[in-house]
Interface confidence: medium
């Protein structure tokens, strides 16, 4: 015998309360597939979350984060506070990267500068809190009298080209 619920399309549910007829999902709920016996509650983008896509009867709402925060987790399940470049988020808030580490984004942790010597290279540009070192040719390749280290380049937003 065919399940009467299998006829219920997305946006409806097979309603126990009405002898298993297909009823539309109530407001603020959805069913993304047919044959569902219940609709799911729409996600609410509240507080630091903001609505990227409204909920419809057939699809859930999608959230992202308000300015000053960024998404974490599958489907932006959490919003985490942004820090400045050169900082990382700790339990006590945004803290500057320790010497020898950098963070070139508004999120994530401070990471150690690259150890150029592991690759047999020299430091071409010193690291900063916001930037990794730039490794250059090996010391043997440098011409006599040339300075081996350049001061750090001014920090800039990742993905932007220099002015």
């Amino acid at each position: 015998l065919q399940d009467p619920c299998s006829n219920c399309p997305a946006g409806t549910f097979c309603d126990n309360n009405r002898n298993q007829i297909c009823s539309p999902c109530p407001p603020n709920s959805f069913s993304s597939a047919g044959g569902q016996r219940t609709c799911d509650i729409c996600r609410q983008c509240k507080g630091v979350f903001r609505t990227r896509k409204e909920c419809s009867s057939t699809s859930n709402a999608e959230c992202d984060c308000t300015p000053g925060f960024h998404c974490l987790g599958a489907g932006c399940s959490m919003c985490e506070q942004d820090c400045k470049q050169g900082q990382e988020l700790t339990k006590k808030g945004c803290k500057d990267c320790c010497f020898g580490t950098f963070n070139d984004q508004k999120r994530g942790i401070c990471r150690p500068w690259t150890n150029c010597s592991l690759d047999g290279k020299s430091v071409l540009v010193n690291g900063t809190k916001e930037r990794d070192v730039v490794c250059g040719p090996s010391p043997a390749d440098l011409s006599p009298g040339a300075s081996s280290v350049t001061p750090p380049a001014p920090a800039r937003e990742p993905g932007h080209s220099p002015q």
Partner: antibody, heavy 119, light 107 residues
Framework: QVQLVQSGAEVKKPGASVKVSCKAS????????INWVKQAPGQGLEWIGN????????NYNQKFKDKATITADKSTSTAYMELSSLRSEDTAVYYC????????????WGQGTTVTVSS | DIQMTQSPSSLSASVGDRVTITCRPS??????LNWYQQKPDKTVKLLIY???RLRSGVPSRFSGSGSGTDFTFTISSLQPEDIATYFC?????????FGQGTKLEIK
Amino acid sequence: QVQLVQSGAEVKKPGASVKVSCKASGYTFTSYWINWVKQAPGQGLEWIGNIYPSDSYTNYNQKFKDKATITADKSTSTAYMELSSLRSEDTAVYYCTRDYGSAYSFHPWGQGTTVTVSS
Amino acid sequence: DIQMTQSPSSLSASVGDRVTITCRPSQDISNYLNWYQQKPDKTVKLLIYYTSRLRSGVPSRFSGSGSGTDFTFTISSLQPEDIATYFCQQGDTLPYTFGQGTKLEIK
């Protein structure tokens, strides 16, 4: 916010009837089922029945079929449950609660109405 | 009607303890299992719906799991404000039925 406010406590004599009201606010009254639940003193919860205010479609627990009548007034966003031929075993707290919209769960709940049947 | 067997009927635990309540329906109810909290002042709140989904605004120390005929409700770290009676409820089949409740007290 979504709220259900029930009428006050009632004391009735055996054989009488009582009508408990449940006023809804903060949402579209006609779009969600209203359920009624009984809790006798020191006991658990029992589902009595429900109503869909848009078309007054009702379901009843067979146990309460001859005891309870559930109605709704769309114009005032109020659901009612009338209990007839009252007996001492009808003494209980009666709750109205809205369908949450998923998995046949109930939220929010009214504050409850105490009905005491005593001669 | 589907019978809901909830256990234990009462329990006493200390603040910070992990608390577990079980609910066993008399027949398979898929995931149509919901959990409620009734405070001593008789106010009732939905905590978890569809076995494991936390209602918006409910603290994450509450969780649920299971399927079919075996369900569990857990409070990961008991807080003083969790003193209440907890009920399970099946939404699979009319008439909807509740467990008998678990009264939770603080030691």
